[in-house]
Amino acid sequence: AWELTILHTNDVHSRLEQTSEDSSKCVNASRCMGGVARLFTKVQQIRRAEPNVLLLDAGDQYQGTIWFTVYKGAEVAHFMNALRYDAMALGNHEFDNGVEGLIEPLLKEAKFPILSANIKAKGPLASQISGLYLPYKVLPVGDEVVGIVGYTSKETPFLSNPGTNLVFEDEITALQPEVDKLKTLNVNKIIALGHSGFEMDKLIAQKVRGVDVVVGGHSNTFLYTGNPPSKEVPAGKYPFIVTSDDGRKVPVVQAYAFGKYLGYLKIEFDERGNVISSHGNPILLNSSIPEDPSIKADINKWRIKLDNYSTQELGKTIVYLDGSSQSCRFRECNMGNLICDAMINNNLRHTDEMFWNHVSMCILNGGGIRSPIDERNNGTITWENLAAVLPFGGTFDLVQLKGSTLKKAFEHSVHRYGQSTGEFLQVGGIHVVYDLSRKPGDRVVKLDVLCTKCRVPSYDPLKMDEVYKVILPNFLANGGDGFQMIKDELLRHDSGDQDINVVSTYISKMKVIYPAVEGRIKFSTGSH
């Protein structure tokens, strides 16, 4: 038997520095976790102790903190090279700055193979990108070889900006011929490394003949065997074992997100490349693991530019941006409108001639808006200002919900109106009218939503049975502020871009902003 140790990360989302337990900014260093310096310590420790080790990343290194905003992927290449990653799969967020924003900083600079079998380039891009990413790579490990085949969510055109010259094929259809090719090359140990979410990971394990192990990402799935070491609740055992259609036991793993854990999987292969056992667990990268001093020094050097950036002007406002709780928790506020407009603008994807855009709606809990911005400071808006408005380091995600769920959400928005509670919703692409004289749970008297399947956008009544796409904070997608109905009833959830980054990009693009209060939220006569 031959033993392989797979170390894996996924959905690191720009957490190069250590973070607090909830993956936001590190405040008390003795309680902080993750970060590349700490990760390197653990990886090196395992490399020294064990003979056959692979360090893999399942995508979405891009997007999540000011590190990505400033360095645009150069930081990913630099520190992944320093950690000596063996391979990476492309995630949807790797396309956030377009194909150029992937090619120049990452694909050309990475000293490790970057993989995806189901992304096919066409037109002029085909020759430009040729060889910069691969469908698979055969890696020598000790005296053996291991094939790694990559995959990426086929939803990427709806989630990011890959442009029109990349075709995202069905994962299973694209993977099978590549695995077959590896088999003809006498590679009998094959890892599928990719970024399509846990459900697709399990389907790949079940359907793709010849895949021995699946290392996934995208769904931030936490798997654990035994008592979990932090706050994350396991979605299943680690590894999660799938019986393939041809009767093999295929381990599937993921390691939550944000570099908080290092996935650690030990696989035993027989001489024919069959997996005969697998075990392991994610390793919590807490403060008991010291940060590597040389990587830490490098981080501190790269940090300097970030501090300068946060005080630079992004754009100007010529109006007061009212982010006060007195406004945003009680009525339509122009800061809420600005943020929702930025959220929709960030999700403009003209992928279908029938639709002007795939999504038109935004909801945002008023309690998530933490500060106003005064225009009397020469109108200047900086990253620092936005960090005061959106201090929680969340993301603006894409979900699919039935109209009935949205109706429940808007009822919840005002079920205890008047107590300055955070669940009061700010909106975009939605016109809502409340009647507060009615009993809680029956206060929404009108709810119109902006059409998407139209050439001239207009507002139509919400249909209870229709499925709608909505952009919202991850906090709401996870049921925060009492929006349990969203968490329980959502039909799809894809994590999006860092909240501050979305708003800062929008302001930079617009240069001068003047959001108004324009009647998105109304109260019917006599009740307010």
Partner: antibody, heavy 118, light 107 residues
Framework: QVQLVQSGAEVKKPGASVKVSCKTS????????IYWVRQAPGQRLEWMGW????????KYNEKFKGRVTITADTSASTAYMELSSLRSEDTAVYYC???????????WGQGTLVTVSS | DIQMTQSPSSLSASVGDRVTITCKAS??????VAWYQQKPGKAPKLLIY???TRHTGVPSRFSGSGSGTDHTLTISSLQPEDFATYYC?????????FGQGTKLEIK
């Protein structure tokens, strides 16, 4: 400890259907596969199919396709195997079994005797 | 389907004997073979999987070996409780198939 308790013996007429239950305890039902295996008198064991209660992934042995239906009730931690269009050669002891990561039929129910006779 | 053929079909032995049962697959099944013990009126009990991995609680006198098409179950020193019928099974590919069984009787 892991337990799989099956329903009692059944006598059926040719052409009828039988539904055998397998109630599990001592582990998380949705985390493991349940397999169905039968053994006719003096014959070898025969795998019929499986179900994964976690996502209801089901696979049948082609030999039984169209006649066998495997289901699971996660709230009751119980798996079911229904065999239709019964014939005399279906007289057998029917077992449910649970896997254990890399072992397929690691834990077995006590078996249910199904007799098909006119 | 892969056929699994056991030999012998039955054998007599005494307590303390070393016993070997073989199983031949109709095609290469690598090391994907399991062995079960069944006593009359009882469900089978898993002994070994992946050719040579003993299941939890199985005594060390039971061992397995082989690769490809030829596989072997060995009981190094027979105990009174070992008299039963033994089945091999391939878990190389679906449909999973079993051998016809080897009945081990007291001499």
């Amino acid at each position: 400890q892991v337990q799989l308790v099956q329903s009692g013996a059944e006598v059926k007429k040719p052409g009828a259907s039988v539904k055998v239950s397998c109630k599990t305890s001592g582990y998380t039902f949705t985390n493991y596969y349940i397999y169905w295996v039968r053994q006719a008198p003096g014959q070898r064991l025969e795998w019929m199919g499986w179900i994964y209660p976690g996502n209801l992934n089901i696979k049948y042995n082609e030999k039984f396709k169209g006649r066998v239906t495997i289901t699971a009730d996660t709230s009751a931690s119980t798996a079911y195997m229904e065999l239709s269009s019964l014939r005399s050669e279906d007289t057998a002891v029917y077992y449910c079994a649970r896997d254990d990561n890399y072992a397929w039929f690691a834990y077995w129910g006590q078996g249910t005797l199904v007799t098909v006779s006119s | 389907d892969i056929q699994m053929t056991q030999s012998p079909s039955s054998l007599s032995a005494s307590v303390g004997d070393r016993v070997t049962i073989t199983c031949k697959a109709s095609q290469d099944v690598s090391t994907a073979v399991a062995w079960y013990q069944q006593k009359p009126g009882k469900a089978p009990k898993l002994l070994i999987y992946w050719t040579n991995t003993r299941h939890t609680g199985v005594p060390s006198r039971f061992s397995g070996s082989g690769s490809g098409t030829d596989h072997t179950l060995t009981i190094s020193s027979l105990q009174p409780e070992d008299f039963a019928t033994y089945y091999c099974q391939q878990h190389y590919s679906t449909p999973f198939t079993f051998g016809q069984g080897t009945k081990l009787e007291i001499k």
